[in-house]
Amino acid sequence: VTGSRVYPANEVTLLDSRSVQGELGWIASPLEGGWEEVSIMDEKNTPIRTYQVCNVMEPSQNNWLRTDWITREGAQRVYIEIKFTLRDCNSLPGVMGTCKETFNLYYYESDNDKERFIRENQFVKIDTIAADESFTQVDIGDRIMKLNTEIRDVGPLSKKGFYLAFQDVGACIALVSVRVFYKKCPLTVRNLAQFPDTITGADTSSLVEVRGSCVNNSEEKDVPKMYCGADGEWLVPIGNCLCNAGHEERSGECQACKIGYYKALSTDATCAKCPPHSYSVWEGATSCTCDRGFFRADNDAASMPCTRPPSAPLNLISNVNETSVNLEWSSPQNTGGRQDISYNVVCKKCGAGDPSKCRPCGSGVHYTPQQNGLKTTKVSITDLLAHTNYTFEIWAVNGVSKYNPSPDQSVSVTVTTNQAAPSSIALVQAKEVTRYSVALAWLEPDRPNGVILEYEVKYYEKDQNERSYRIVRTAARNTDIKGLNPLTSYVFHVRARTAAGYGDFSEPLEVTTNTVPSRIIGDGANST
């Protein structure tokens, strides 16, 4: 029975005489008068078995002690650690010619674990062992036994096991402990690759190449390799593994992303929080599920927020010019969180008696610049039929519109084509300008071409460049535009509408709001 003693992780003990409970029972030659098994107390008052010999008075000593058979366990090189005490010959009277201060260490490889006799000629010498510290009679009196530790190695070994032997040639010696071990590079994980226990090579300079295996939930990026050095240390890690999608490195292993996190690819990145408007309900998510009403386009990365279709375009205005219609609108209030917004135009030809009976306009109608995928907020439609009701729908679309098409994404206008809409208004004037308002007035168009039903004023801040405009409608030839910002340049356009539709807008009138009230007359082009 052996008791366990703690040694370095890179050493595997094959024999430890101090761990043996009871007699060691090694073979001595001669059987008597040479090596003798003696029980002594160690530094912790634990009994340990030792072998002693002290035939220093007699010449030509040749006392052999052989261990039991020691299994090799696949090791090619083993290490022998001997702890011993040795008496100083100078401290012994009358032994000058016969006392020695060394002993010899031998080994013999064998597949036979039950060899009963010592055959000296079978053994190969490892080394002569000398003491760094020898002790005298004074040391014995003081109970100071000077313990020597010597380590030798032997290899390459090839048979199943071996025997060790100690040859005494006339020393006063006590073998306190004998430990035989080999070195291994212990199981380790590096770069998410596991490297197994690996026995070191046959010679003291050899490196054993070992291929690692990726830990659970990981895959090879480059082949993971390490070298096991002769001292039992791992050297030169090469290559690595990466945690699979849905997993991240944590304490040398690949663990599933937590709920609410995801990882789309096998990379060395950590899991990321689900992007806006998405979630994950399981551990180990490789992508996150979009919230209800939100979507991902086919080419959207997993890291992109989920988005939704845009709302309808705003402020759709039409301008009928005989059998042509110009449509203009503003961007939707909500783009759905995407930049890839475009517009499609749907044209329907409707019966005069029953506006609900509408049919597609057909291929004879032409759109400038195009009917679908418009990037601008205006379109010109030509080659319509005269005196016909048309309904035009402007659809705002983005990369996810196809997943949830809804009428909420369009705005429509119904017009009647004619032979002549009113001409444009020649003169627009700013009658009064205050901090927050502008009073406008204008003349009737030169050619009304019918009864003027109303006027439409379009205005916007000059530096907004017509991107964000407002519309005011009035039956009179003047209006007060309120709610403006002080000291801000505004651009105004006015047009007239008859039953035939809208005329063209007037030339722009630019007005800057004041800090103090003033009464001025504009000239239709510029006013300050």
Partner: antibody, heavy 115, light 109 residues
């Protein structure tokens, strides 16, 4: 779902002590488990964690002083060589699968180290 | 390894009042929001209040509010009740390590 620590007692310095956390209502193969301690009148201190896989990880200050292991229904904390500074209430706690933190705690067990 | 600095170490407030506890991390916590708040009363186990910096744990009254991101986090307790007298701890996670703040003892006057 509950946790119950046991094994806390008075020990002399240097005498190894093992605390046990018994789990019920969930599987240790699905959750990571941590140990946390609290010295009398002091704050909470995270010791270490045993992952579902059985691998362990310790706070820097705890390395070599504690060993965490588990069976199918228990998680053990071994205090390898207790000192008087290890006198504390020891809690085992379950790491959430939803967030990084502990969502279920045991009532704790008191360890007193004194000569 | 992340260090969590909690302030103040103690605070006293009246019933119906509001208490604010701060927790500062020495570096950004994992995901910028992996921070939890716990309440502990004498002789009892810690109780989870808030996780992921701002999500209220099940059964916790909405008087408890967590906020913050990265390195700065706050726990606010409004409409204080006598039952809120306890010590409150933040817990941060980063690079395999958990760290508790030093704790804030809340007394109710």
């Amino acid at each position: 779902q509950s946790l119950e620590e046991s094994g806390g007692r008075l020990v002399t310095p240097g005498t190894p002590l093992t605390l046990t956390c018994t789990v019920s209502g969930f599987s240790l193969s699905s959750y990571h488990m941590s140990w946390v301690r609290q010295a009398p009148g002091k704050g909470l201190e995270w010791i270490g964690i045993i992952y579902r896989s059985g691998n362990t990880y310790y706070a820097n200050w705890a390395k070599g002083r504690f060993t965490i292991s588990k069976t199918s229904t228990t998680v053990d904390l071994k205090i390898t060589s207790p000192t008087t500074e290890d006198t504390a209430t020891y809690f085992c706690a379950r790491e959430s699968s939803t967030f990084y933190g502990m969502d279920l705690w045991g009532p704790g067990t008191l360890v007193t180290v004194s000569s | 390894y992340v260090m969590m600095t909690q302030t103040p170490s103690s605070v006293s407030a009246a019933v119906g009042g509001t208490v604010t506890i701060n927790c500062q991390a020495s570096q950004s916590v994992y995901g910028n929001n992996e921070l939890a708040w716990y309440q502990q009363k004498p002789g009892q186990r810690p109780k989870l209040l808030i996780y992921r910096a701002s999500t209220l744990a099940s059964g916790v009254p909405s008087r408890f509010k967590g906020s913050g991101s990265g390195t700065e986090f706050t726990l606010t307790i409004s409409d204080l009740e006598c039952a809120d007298a306890a010590t409150y701890y933040c817990l941060g996670y980063k690079s395999d390590d958990y760290t508790f703040g030093g704790g804030t003892k809340v007394e109710i006057k």
